[in-house]
Amino acid sequence: IVLRPSRVHNSEENTMRALTLKDILNGTFSYKTFFPNWISGQEYLHQSADNNIVLYNIETGQSYTILSNRTMKSVNASNYGLSPDRQFVYLESDYSKLWRYSYTATYYIYDLSNGEFVRGNELPRPIQYLCWSPVGSKLAYVYQNNIYLKQRPGDPPFQITFNGRENKIFNGIPDWVYEEEMLATKYALWWSPNGKFLAYAEFNDTDIPVIAYSYYGDEQYPRTINIPYPKAGAKNPVVRIFIIDTTYPAYVGPQEVPVPAMIASSDYYFSWLTWVTDERVCLQWLKRVQNVSVLSICDFREDWQTWDCPKTQEHIEESRTGWAGGFFVSTPVFSYDAISYYKIFSDKDGYKHIHYIKDTVENAIQITSGKWEAINIFRVTQDSLFYSSNEFEEYPGRRNIYRISIGSYPPSKKCVTCHLRKERCQYYTASFSDYAKYYALVCYGPGIPISTLHDGRTDQEIKILEENKELENALKNIQLPKEEIKKLEVDEITLWYKMILPPQFDRSKKYPLLIQVYGGPCSQSVRSVFAVNWISYLASKEGMVIALVDGRGTAFQGDKLLYAVYRKLGVYEVEDQITAVRKFIEMGFIDEKRIAIWGWSYGGYVSSLALASGTGLFKCGIAVAPVSSWEYYASVYTERFMGLPTKDDNLEHYKNSTVMARAEYFRNVDYLLIHGTADDNVHFQNSAQIAKALVNAQVDFQAMWYSDQNHGLSGLSTNHLYTHMTHFLKQCFSLSD
């Protein structure tokens, strides 16, 4: 026997190292994506590594810098926008975040023809939103909750609205609840295709109750932040939609678009606006009880200078088993005849599919079908419809891009992405140029993400835009965990799960188990995507098994699973996590004395309820920024799934589903409760009430607050948070530090 010094064993395993928490917190293994900023059928802009704005022409293969990094730096610009006539660029600086999507900024207009900034009639600051018209170089912007229009960047502004008032009237931008729960944008104004008209929403928050919380800052006295925020059952914003002719804005001024009578008869929401042509617009409305949606197509009446929305152009979408739509009601994609459209909604079997609506919803032609779901319609051209779905190989957590030929009969379907890089890429999105002449595919995993450019006619790959080579090289000596996506069949319910296993996983050994849960309605956690994150580290370095489970209420597997939680939040989501844990124990490699659960936001709610389920399954758990009672959360979101907290509606389940009601059950678990004090979304109130209930029940628990931090717990708080949670879990699992 020859004994060799270990250094001679220069095998792969010896040179490879586990992930560290530092790797995660430093973002060492983050990836890049490439989304072209399309400006025509064959041209796009991209900000180079050295911050020049470069225009690429796919057909000539040429590229040139349209804006130098020197110009960008002169105003500290962090973003830009080219006018469609290519004469001007707006430069955005002094970015100041407000809520999830909204921010204010300072804007400078740069004239490309003379290489100078536009002087005279400069824009005020800070601006809440600014955008170019789709043609030419008109500007619309929102300043102090009012909308302004400029025919040219150097012109004096035309003030469109005058009633804007902080926290009271919002013009062209959403209030808090519309931004977060309905529009998912920072803007609420929409140019018509050729810039003739500008549509905008006005939100009146005068009667909405206000959430107030302290912002401690550095001053002697804390500031109070006040946000009109309708909680479940409270008074909601009143919305009105107006359209103004931007060629002659003072001619008749803003004209209000009528609300369909069946919607206006009680509380309602505006959900989206889609321009069809310059003189046809489509509005979507939703009853406050969110199971009825109306799509209304309106036409400009030149003779009356008004917008007419005939009843014959109203299309009703109703759900009898849950709420309308998925997370949001889907938006229409109009075809070239400017009246018929494609839209995703539930078919008779309860799966979300693409339908073609020509006259009435009842006569809709189903375009896709099967026990899977169409997820997004990217583009409709005269001969093709591009969409994404999770059809391929029956994995709900995948996304592939398909093309349906609508120019021929019968229409033929082709999967564009299914076999491109099959092992590496199973989760795609796409970005199309004008007329879908070209498109970019962005693959998010399960392998290292890659972005590619393709010919819109042949689907041929033209070039790789970003392949994350540096990341690939950096990961070569890292012991990454193994990941598997599988399913459990329990009582006619399919529970898909993702398991993240330590690099040297051995089925004959026992491992601590951490469940990571979100579980909110219409969410999906089990996805075939690449990630090197905190749970990757826990598996790689700390030897934990981590599992994510999509239970009832989650998306893209049909209405039966999705709507199972309707009016009963906090029941089945928790049951299904528990069921999955029991199945994992049966697999034989889980140490049943070391099982934990953690989640953030809705996941914090589910993890709290799971810990307090009285099953004895969980040793410990963490809730970050949890909802604790649905009476504390936003009306638009909560009522969609729970109805109203009134005696004649669903008050009983609102009361039964609180974390506080289960305070006694936390006695036999280790609970770590975490929340930011400046959380505008899930208010600190939620955790304050949990803590109060636990104290009143004389139950011991651990807690951490993050002063002046919002729902995201960003910056240095992130490092502190993950370090703190790591210590907690290692202590819980008796792992040495």
Epitope: F158, A250, G253, E256, V257, P258, W304, T306
Partner: nanobody, 125 residues
Framework: EVQLVESGGGLVQPGGSLRLSCAAS????????MYWVRQAPGKGLEWVSA???????EYPDSVKGRFTISRDNAKNTLYLQMNSLRPEDTAVYYC???????????????????WGQGTLVTVSS
């Protein structure tokens, strides 16, 4: 009762000027959109100028730079100053008003809510 009474029309030579007035009564003048609209012999209606409640003005290309609309809110009067008149400006000129709708009152039967009787402007040598 809403009343709009135009005056100031007449015969004028090409290149000449005229000033039309419109006295309004029976409604709150300030928050309205006011117009001068004309109808040439055998032709349809054509708007020639507009002024909004904030005093901002609009003109079609055919009269831009020659006509000026203004309002005197204290006197409830609308004016149209017409310079460099041309034979094709010959028409009956009407003063019209459009009242901003209240909440949920979007429906109309025409672009203007009230009209005057009109005043004739003839441009001829």
């Amino acid at each position: 009762e809403v009343q709009l009474v135009e005056s100031g029309g007449g015969l004028v030579q090409p290149g000449g000027s005229l000033r039309l007035s419109c006295a309004a009564s029976g409604f709150t003048f300030t928050p309205t959109y006011m117009y001068w609209v004309r109808q040439a012999p055998g032709k349809g209606l054509e708007w020639v100028s507009a002024i909004d409640p904030y005093g901002r003005t609009e003109y079609p290309d055919s009269v831009k730079g020659r006509f000026t609309i203004s309002r005197d809110n204290a006197k409830n009067t609308l004016y149209l100053q017409m310079n460099s008149l041309r034979p094709e400006d010959t028409a009956v000129y009407y003063c019209a008003v459009r009242v901003p709708p209240g909440v949920y009152t979007y429906y109309r039967t025409g672009p203007y809510d009230y009209w005057g009787q009109g005043t004739l402007v003839t441009v001829s040598s």
